[in-house]
């Protein structure tokens, strides 16, 4: 996350850690007690390694008595997703066992009203990406509001190029920004969830290029049939 | 641990190019950026440049736009800057950093005829 | 390009006594890092997003500051704190070092 700040701890019981070989890979959203929502493009390289879900925590590094690692049983891609563009870009990780609740751990609504967020409709991204232009990686989530875009602006030839679609939403970008790290978590808007941040190459923090989600509403079918 | 390993000294000739090389153990590079950065006696630190080695993507200086290109290959975990058309403006010691938190150790590199 | 002067260009302390060296930005930026670099030695970071204290550095090193003014203190100057320290922007591309202040130990 750029330009954000630290979260208050455990104040968003639904995110969650997507882990490769025990280290933070993407953000992730608990959506049902044994189901976390990430970006498809995550697990494209965990193909021999070990894909955990970190939920409870606030801290990735310190001991906090709410944070709990859980093994993945299943993964579910879109079947649509492909490596070289960001549509489609979902997946459904189902916990090896129904995620213990309470205060710090707690599935998120998510939209089902397939109806665009009004622009600049301020809304809530959190992850454990870098937070600088180094690329400095946190320990402690952040967290940043930021103002919708209409997808008409986000389509110009001088942002993303009529890449964005009607199953995609656009927040702005102008030095706050999601980033490399906070691919597969939660953009929440009036504290339901509306956007999965994407995972591909774009730059962040430039106002021309803004943040990409993929919006869950249009993906409220396959959702529900993965969960049954 | 985490190390940044680079290669060895360079004694060059005007006009020819140098590809320096930074391996990366107790870290993937592709995690975050790697960082390239130029010394010279009495100029100080300048960065040249950076790396997204999960998507290649890099950013560079203006000022050396043309003279350096900064590749990764995630497999080996290395990261390269190589420099081209050699002048003794480029004489220096060019440092690798991962997340201009770790560095290493720093490649001498001498350009003469 | 954001332009960053560190002042003073060269410095001498006691040990024990408190050093302050700062960094003055052309325009307004929204962090500093500070870094220290002995002779030989590749540079170490200290200090990330003004203030925050990199892992493994001695808690008398403190960063502060905002907008076009940022420094660097060090609270009890000790010998092995005679080094070159360079401040970096991160906050306006393409990203910037000081010129260095150079400490050392009277």
């Known amino acids: 996350i750029l330009g954000g700040r630290e979260a208050e701890a455990h104040a968003r019981p639904y995110m969650a850690s997507v882990q490769l070989n025990g280290a933070h890979l993407c953000g992730g959203v608990l959506v049902a007690e044994q189901w976390v929502l990430s970006a498809a493009h995550c697990l494209e390289d965990a193909a021999d390694g070990k894909v955990q879900v970190l939920l409870g925590a606030h801290s990735l590094s310190q001991p906090e008595p709410s944070k709990r690692l859980y093994d993945v049983l299943r993964a579910v891609p879109h079947p649509d997703s492909q490596p070289d563009t960001i549509d489609h870009d979902l997946l459904l990780l189902q916990l090896s066992e129904k995620a213990t609740l309470g205060p710090a751990v707690r599935p998120l609504p998510w939209q089902r009203v397939d109806r665009d967020v009004a622009p600049g409709t301020l809304c809530d991204v959190a992850g454990w990406g870098i937070v600088n232009h180094a690329g400095r990686r946190p320990d402690s989530l952040q967290h940043v509001l930021l103002p919708v875009l209409d997808r008409a602006t986000c389509n110009r030839r001088t942002h993303h190029d009529g890449a964005i679609t009607e199953r995609l939403m656009c927040a702005e970008s102008n030095r706050r920004d999601s980033c490399k790290g906070d691919s597969g978590g939660p953009l929440v808007c009036g504290g339901v969830l509306e956007g999965v941040v994407t995972s591909g190459s774009r730059v962040c923090g430039n106002r021309k290029k803004p943040g990409i989600y993929t919006r869950v509403a249009s993906y409220a079918a396959w959702i529900d049939s993965v969960l049954a | 641990e985490v190390q940044l390993q680079q290669s060895g000294a360079e004694l060059v000739k005007p006009g020819a190019s140098v590809k320096l090389s930074c391996t990366a153990s107790g870290f993937k590079i592709k995690d975050t950026y790697m960082h390239w950065v130029k010394e010279r006696p009495e100029q100080g630190l300048e960065w040249i440049g950076r790396i997204d080695p999960a998507n290649g993507n890099t950013k560079y200086d203006p000022k050396f736009q043309g003279k350096a290109t900064i590749t990764a290959d995630t497999s080996s975990n290395t990261a390269y800057l190589q420099l081209s058309s050699l002048t003794s403006e480029d004489t220096a010691v060019y440092y690798c950093?991962?997340?201009?938190?770790?560095w290493g150790q720093g490649t001498s590199v001498t350009v003469s005829s | 390009q954001i332009i960053l002067t560190q002042s003073p260009a060269i410095m001498s302390a006691s040990p024990g006594e408190k050093v302050t060296m700062t960094c003055s930005a052309r325009s307004s930026v929204s962090n500093m890092y500070w870094y220290q670099q002995k002779p030989g030695s590749s540079p170490r970071l200290l200090i990330y997003d003004t203030s925050n204290l990199a892992s493994g550095v001695p808690v008398r090193f403190s960063g502060s500051g905002s907008g076009t003014s940022y420094s660097l203190t060090i609270s009890r100057m000790e010998a092995e704190d005679a080094a070159t320290y360079y401040c970096q922007q991160w906050s306006s591309y393409p990203w910037t070092f000081g010129g260095g202040t150079k400490l050392e130990i009277k």
């Open positions: 950093a991962n997340a201009m938190d770790y």
